[in-house]
Amino acid sequence: PEPPTACREKQYLINSQCCSLCQPGQKLVSDCTEFTETECLPCGESEFLDTWNRETHCHQHKYCDPNLGLRVQQKGTSETDTICTCEEGWHCTSEACESCVLHRSCSPGFGVKQIATGVSDTICEPCPVGFFSNVSSAFEKCHPWTSCETKDLVVQQAGTNKTDVVCGPQDRLRA
């Protein structure tokens, strides 16, 4: 028969024949032959391979270096890498989480739209009309201006995106 030019899923073409890939958690020792199956070997302690593969070596689990602000979020297995995350107040700089940076603070005039996590930074938004933020914070949302009317007071100084309104007593005309 004609040698194959393509193979099924979870197979690969080698020496004019289709061989089975090694399952996750195992590495390739030798290709299949006309008479033998693909030979695979389990990954060692602290090693992994996460896909059907023909890798000749397993990869070491990632080290979550505390000197870089990293800690283990999920311990690796023979089929998964260790997942790192960042210490409180910090977040990863990439999906692979190789290093951490301090959460961004939202400047006065901006409030926190979404609080940062171990893998995403703070998302800030400008305070809309009727709201303000007078601090630089990684947690504070924009606050609504004080309602002078509900306190039976009047606005003496208008609010901005960075300052609250200033309320004062109403001028009462004597009869």
Partner: antibody, heavy 120, light 107 residues
């Protein structure tokens, strides 16, 4: 057909940063291990970095560890190399390369290459 | 890491001649060796993988052999487009490494 189209090279001062991109098409990007290989002017090929299909696991040659970051955007079929604290010895043509089915190497498809020159 | 040493550094031959390029590994790479061709101003191109398997679209005049530490790329009859630099690369151990290259030039 498989294509890897690179962008983002150029001249940068020592200590500077640069981001290279590699747009992939013609194959299921997330199923393949991707790598960066560089070639200094008049020199041979040197493996720089590898990222597994998930994007969670990355590997680097010792000389770029802590300075280069490889990432991928699987929905957009794009590979990235963020280079910082660049040195004169990082001057090279950088290639993105795709691993064969089930393996990191050999590299069966390569980008066209992009020149990074680190000089003051 | 595994060091690959290619010889000769330069091979001067005429079209139609047979080219024999050598790649020696500092330790066994079993059969996990590949060969690439690179022309000036171009990206490398995979020729041979796992010692002797031709990549898609590679002509039959290119063949690979060897095992363990000693490998050979043979071009049975050189065509004008074959004059280029050739690199070997191993994947037996991490990290992947390349030889320094052999330049095949026109005599």
């Amino acid at each position: 057909q498989v294509q890897l189209v690179q962008s983002g090279g150029g001249l940068v001062q020592p200590g500077g940063s640069l981001r290279l991109s590699c747009a992939a098409s013609g194959f299921t990007f997330s199923n393949y291990v991707m790598s960066w290989v560089r070639q200094a002017p008049g020199k041979g090929l040197e493996w720089v970095s590898t990222i597994r299909g998930s994007g969670i696991s990355t590997y680097y040659t010792d000389s770029v560890k802590g300075r280069f970051t490889t990432s991928r955007d699987n929905p957009k079929n794009t590979l990235f190399l963020q280079m910082s604290s660049l040195r004169a010895e990082d001057t090279a043509v950088y290639y993105c390369a795709k691993g064969i089915v089930g393996a990191t190497t050999p590299f069966d498809y390569w980008g066209q290459g992009t020149l990074v020159t680190v000089s003051s | 890491e595994i060091v690959l040493t290619q010889s000769p550094a330069t091979l001067s031959l005429s079209p139609g001649e047979r080219a024999t390029l050598s790649c020696r590994a500092s330790q066994s790479v079993r059969s996990f060796l590949a060969w690439y061709q690179q022309k000036p101003g171009q990206a490398p191109r995979l020729l041979i993988y796992e010692t002797s398997n031709r990549a898609t679209g590679i002509p039959a005049r290119f063949s690979g052999s060897g095992s363990g530490t000693d490998f050979t790329l043979t071009i049975s009859s050189l065509e004008p487009e074959d004059f280029a630099v050739y690199y070997c690369q191993q994947r037996s151990d991490w990290p992947p490494t390349f030889g320094q290259g052999t330049k095949v030039e026109i005599k």
